[in-house]
Amino acid sequence: KLTIESTPFNVAEGKEVLLLVHNLPQHLFGYSWYKGERVDGNRQIIGYVIGTQQATPGPAYSGREIIYPNASLLIQNIIQNDTGFYTLHVIKSDLVNEEATGQFRVYPELPKPSISSNNSKPVEDKDAVAFTCEPETQDATYLWWVNNQSLPVSPRLQLSNGNRTLTLFNVTRNDTASYKCETQNPVSARRSDSVILNVLYGPDAPTISPLNTSYRSGENLNLSCHAASNPPAQYSWFVNGTFQQSTQELFIPNITVNNSGSYTCQAHNSDTGLNRTTVTTITVYAEPPKPFITSNNSNPVEDEDAVALTCEPEIQNTTYLWWVNNQSLPVSPRLQLSNDNRTLTLLSVTRNDVGPYECGIQNKLSVDHSDPVILNVLYGPDDPTISPSYTYYRPGVNLSLSCHAASNPPAQYSWLIDGNIQQHTQELFISNITEKNSGLYTCQANNSASGHSRTTVKTITVSAELPKPSISSNNSKPVEDKDAVAFTCEPEAQNTTYLWWVNGQSLPVSPRLQLSNGNRTLTLFNVTRNDARAYVCGIQNSVSANRSDPVTLDVLYGPDTPIISPPDSSYLSGANLNLSCHSASNPSPQYSWRINGIPQQHTQVLFIAKITPNNNGTYACFVSNLATGRNNSIVKSITVSASGTSPGLSA
């Protein structure tokens, strides 16, 4: 069918477009292009008559169109008004007409956009900021980028005005980022320079470091205060409510028990006018106390949560030790110790990480141990397993299915048959089953603590007749002397005997043949080309028997050492040399020849007409099997004697 393809479909102003004609009929009288969706003489652009090779402009011709002998139309220096449909009218040699319509769209090249903002210094949790992408352009799509990534999904981010305006409600310090806007149409895309949003925030509640609150008598006390703030905060220190100094750090050398007390840091932001304070209680000991373990998560979820165990109290210049299962810490990428060894972090906990865990503080003479702590790791449910594994049952027997999924806390179980809920138990029992009990049996395991659910579906067929079995294979194209193949007879059925035949005969005795899985699986070790036979499995019980369709094993082998024929090696000058190479191989090999080491043709037969003594030499045939990845070759010496000479025999 005659069709028109526009190349490109979306055209930039000033560029060109080719209306390409496909399936143009063979014998033509002429053809003509029209602007619009139909043939209309008033809107004819240009016509072309084959016989005279004459192009005739029409009323819609602009001087920017070129018609080609293959009927394609090139329109140059495209303007907006060129957008739309174009119809080709073909008059065939038999004067029968054909028409086809194509179209394209014209878009302007976009300028580089810029971002305007209604608020250059917004205050956190108070102000909103509206960014607008300039200029406004028709038929353009507006996109926004934050730190060179697409906009995150957030209820505080709102696009409006055809995505031209990006509003950030209730700005936060995390909105301090590089913002760019982009304008796109089908022919161009331009990105603005970045605008950095400067959000005023804080001060937050200051943090006093180091975190340890327990010290030994005679040490130096060096406290530092920091509060997140923009612009940076101004700091003041108070001890037991009494002002000390307006600095970020507080230093007291050679402390005593009398330096115990409450230490307050106050942070002030002059732009937001806000103050925040933090108090830490410092205790100065003569000797360290018995340690204890605190945890940031008492019920972590497997593969989701990390757990940080901290040895308390924090005492400067103290060595902390850890034990798991009464042994020192094993080396593991999931176990991390803090710089001071006080905090042990278990990354991505597993069900095996329950413990117990102990920490200790090194004294001058001994180690003080904490009480052991055991983690309660929530996990599962894993994929439930339904037992027994049978899928076929005879009518009249009892169906008893049990479901189990590893889970902490233990899973809650539900059974569904064909999608309909049956009961909320771990076991499903149906007595005296009939064919009507065939269907999809689903066990659903649910862990209420983690909120996770997993299901397993089992197809149960109740039938007096055994189904026609089928053979599944773990390797459809094994390689000779390399691969093993395991055939499995499907399905697994209760009280059923499995049988195998090879080429219509029972299995031969061979150390390379092994039956397993109740004779359901037949494994061929180190396959050979002779194993490329028809394999059939059968199932039978006291009521019925059935056989599978044969499965033929396709063994890939070779290439064997090739044979060059004819065997002659001596020829008379002027004779034709016609050498054929053959190698046993599956799939068929690729052949190539070399004469005196020089590559020739990639054919099975090498033919040289009217040979001369110049054709003396070694003729090598190379064979290659791409499927097995193996190669082989053979070399033959050819002697060509001058016409009058009787050639001597040679091997």
Partner: antibody
């Protein structure tokens, strides 16, 4: 399917006038030139006149030049032939034919479809 | 402009081939490849059979063929059939002022 239907023929006295019409359908009328030919009783075909697809260009046989006027109304898909100063030798069956010219240039195109004709008789 | 010359009649038996000639001058037939042939049965409108010397429109049997040599064009009907009995007219483009001229016509009789 292309159809051409002539009308307007009849008996007219020498020196009289007639206007023949040809209603066209089944093709894009304003893309093709249109023509009139005639055939006197028992005689051969004679080309009379052709008009281009736009109607801008007209052509006449020497025997009718100055007396016959060809025109077309592309909005009605209709071709006309105004016949004045009729003579006895103008007696003929007048055929409307698609073709003669193609598109807007002077590109020859065969008369690929013909109407059934209308008889003009000039007699006193 | 005088009419193109055609034989008054041509006859042939069914199955035979016949050829009708159309002779003009170098100003018409010889000057352009715009020769057409029309078939007209008695009381009927003409029908286009060949155009541009040798091209056949859709629906025309391939028993009809056209050719041209110098100032003479020819229409050949092979495997003559009873329904081919009719008048045949040739036509040629002349110039950009007086566009067309017809032949005097040839009566084809199937014996």
């Amino acid at each position: 399917e292309v159809q051409l239907l002539e009308s307007g023929g009849g008996l007219v006295q020498p020196g009289g006038s007639l206007r023949l019409s040809c209603a066209a359908s089944g093709f894009t009328f304003n893309t093709y030139g249109m023509s009139w030919a005639r055939q006197a009783p028992g005689k051969g075909l004679e080309w009379v006149s052709t008009i281009s697809g736009s109607g801008d260009n007209t052509y006449y046989a020497d025997s009718v030049k100055g007396r016959f006027t060809i025109s077309r109304d592309n909005s009605k898909n209709t071709l006309y032939l105004q016949i004045n100063s009729l003579r006895a030798e103008d007696t003929a069956v007048y055929y409307c034919a698609k073709g003669g010219l193609l598109w807007f240039g002077e590109l020859p195109y065969p008369f690929d479809y013909w109407g059934q004709g209308t008889l003009v008789t000039v007699s006193s | 402009q005088s009419a193109l010359t055609q034989p008054a009649s041509v006859s042939g038996s069914p199955g035979q081939s016949i050829t009708i000639s159309c002779t003009g001058t170098s100003s018409d037939v010889g000057g352009y490849n715009y020769v057409s042939w029309y078939q007209q049965h008695p009381g009927k409108a003409p029908k286009l059979m060949i155009y541009d010397v040798s091209n056949r429109p859709s629906g025309v049997s391939n028993r009809f063929s056209g050719s041209k040599s110098d100032n003479t064009a020819s229409l050949t009907i092979s495997g003559l059939q009873a329904e081919d009995e009719a008048d045949y007219y040739c036509s040629s483009y002349i110039s950009t002022s007086t566009l067309y001229v017809f032949g005097i016509g040839t009566k084809v009789t199937v014996l």
